[in-house]
């Protein structure tokens, strides 16, 4: 008689996670009588997947009715496949006995599970970086299989090239993770910019997953300062203006110093946004020239987003102006700031009322 063959026709089967996998197995003969068992893996550590004779296997069903007369089809269907089900499955014929004796194994069918990557999560630097500096963004996605995957970075639609990507683990696994780092040069125009991490995988049918990060979370645009003097008013007062422009974020404190002494401190709040996402602020100080004998050195000191203060000074010439009796002995502290809608509501109105 011809020797029994255990035939597993497919060398490999690929199934999407959540679907059912059919593993085919037929035997070439009804002889000898005895059950078929399915195992994942070979050798002593193999895992029993299905035993026609006995046991409870809730996710596994026989494709062919096992009670069918002269049944030689021992294919099985495994439902609700997960990446953990990946492996090589063997159909093994046993000879009836007490206990049944293993007789012959099929060549095995490798089950690979196509699992979608998780939505990419993009994270930026923990602290803001100043424009014209380079920062790193990371993108992570997990749980995909097979291992082949493509990840691209874009900034405002332009692909980034300074990228380092790793897929783990390096060896065989039921599922994989990808981690990529992109280095991005920040410019002053990047407040409204966005970086996108795009992941393409066979399971996504050409519709890649995207994760985004706004550069507004990562960037600091330092202000430009300009101090100017308006023309002398009839009442001997000079209006000195400090223009703070093109800064981001809004967190900013401005201090006026007269000859090195603090005259007034203000906090930026509810500023209107420029088209490019930055902010402008103008503060002014009325200086009573007649109260001073000597020239007045005015300093506009700006502390932006916790960074070291930036100063801009201006000297008001008083020698050219006659003194008046009974006038104030100090410059009058008045100032205002441009106001508009803003997300920054931290500072209440006390910062905007200035007392003589």
């Amino acid at each position: 008689e011809e020797e029994l063959q255990v035939i597993q026709p497919e060398k490999s089967v690929s199934v999407a996670a959540g679907d059912s996998a059919t593993l085919n197995c037929t035997v070439s003969s009804l002889i000898p009588v005895g059950p078929i068992q399915w195992f994942r893996g070979a050798g002593p550590g193999r895992e029993l997947i299905y035993n026609l004779k006995e046991g409870h296997f809730p996710r596994v069903t026989a494709v062919s009715d096992p009670t069918k007369r002269n049944n030689m089809d021992f294919s099985i269907r495994i439902s609700n496949i997960t990446p953990a089900d990946a492996g090589t499955y063997y159909c093994v014929k046993f000879r009836k006995g007490s206990p049944d004796v293993e007789l012959k194994s099929g060549a095995g069918t490798e089950l690979s599970v196509r699992a979608k990557p998780s939505a990419p999560v993009v994270s930026g630097p923990a602290v803001r970086a100043t424009a014209e500096h380079t920062v790193s963004f990371t993108c992570e996605s997990h749980g995909f299989s097979p291992r082949d995957i493509t990840l691209k970075w874009f900034k405002n639609g332009n692909e980034l090239s300074d990228v380092q990507t790793n897929v783990d683990p390096a060896g065989k696994s039921v599922s994989y993770s990808i981690r990529s780092t992109a280095r991005v040069l920040l410019t002053r125009r990047d407040v409204h910019s966005q970086v996108i991490c795009e992941v393409a995988h066979v399971t996504l049918q050409g519709d890649p997953l995207r994760g985004t990060a706004n550069l507004s979370e990562a960037i600091r645009v330092p202000p430009f300062l300009e101090v100017t003097q308006q023309s002398m008013r009839a009442d001997n007062q000079v209006n000195v203006t400090c223009q703070v422009t093109k800064f981001y974020p809004q967190r900013l404190q401005l201090t006026w110093l007269e000859n090195g002494n603090v005259s007034r401190t203000e906090m930026a709040s509810a500023l209107p946004e420029n088209k490019d996402g930055t902010y402008n602020w103008t503060s002014w100080l009325l200086v009573n020239v007649s109260a001073h004998r000597d020239d007045v050195k005015l300093t506009c000191q700006v502390e932006h987003d916790g960074q070291p203060a930036v100063n801009k000074s201006f000297s008001v010439k008083v020698s050219a102006h006659p003194k008046e009796q009974g006038s104030n002995t100090a410059a009058e502290n008045t100032g205002t700031n441009e106001r508009g809608s803003s997300d920054y509501k931290d500072d209440d109105d006390k910062h905007h009322h200035h007392h003589h």
Partner: antibody, heavy 119, light 110 residues
Framework: QVQLVQSGAEVKKPGASVKVSCKAS????????INWVRQAPGQGLEWIAM????????HYNQIFKDRATLTTDTSTSTAYMELRSLRSDDTAVYYC????????????WGRGTLVTVSS | DIVLTQSPDSLAVSLGERATINCRAS??????????IFWYQQKPGQPPKLLIY???NLDSGVPDRFSGSGSGTDFTLTISSLQAEDVAVYYC????????FGQGTKLEIK
Amino acid sequence: QVQLVQSGAEVKKPGASVKVSCKASGYTFTNYWINWVRQAPGQGLEWIAMIDPSDSETHYNQIFKDRATLTTDTSTSTAYMELRSLRSDDTAVYYCAMDYGSLYAMDYWGRGTLVTVSS
Amino acid sequence: DIVLTQSPDSLAVSLGERATINCRASKSVSSSGYNYIFWYQQKPGQPPKLLIYLASNLDSGVPDRFSGSGSGTDFTLTISSLQAEDVAVYYCQESRELPTFGQGTKLEIK
């Protein structure tokens, strides 16, 4: 280890019915046919019928078609054979047997249940 | 229905000698290359025990002094060297159609 444990001996009057049980263990009950065979005292083996516990498909020997009914209870892995309108010549040992190879053969047997029909 | 006829009805053989039991079917029991004949041994007070399946295949745990042969309609059970424990009634069964049994052959020691 496959085991088929049958119910105890019965004494019945002619015209009555008997229901013999066969509790299976050591294998998946729904994956194999159960046969019923009887043997009158000093006589040969006579096949009665068979049942597939997975879907209750049955095949009967024409001789018993009108009097025998096979059923199963998959929750307890038990097969039953009821024989109605008993006659004295139904006195026999009734065996259940499991078909392990789906060849319509009898690989494993119960120890038998003696049914005596006597007035 | 297929009718199986065994011969002889009874047989006495000396210990160590060959015993041969025949089974003839009223029509062929062959299908798809298999011969659907089975042989059983029944000792007093015990249920039958499967010896041979599909005409020539020894069941698990059956001593190899037992063998089966034949095809189509004529089949033979052979015990090559009779042992005392082989005393029993032997039945053939077919399953080409629904199961039927032969009438049995009683084997004794001469």
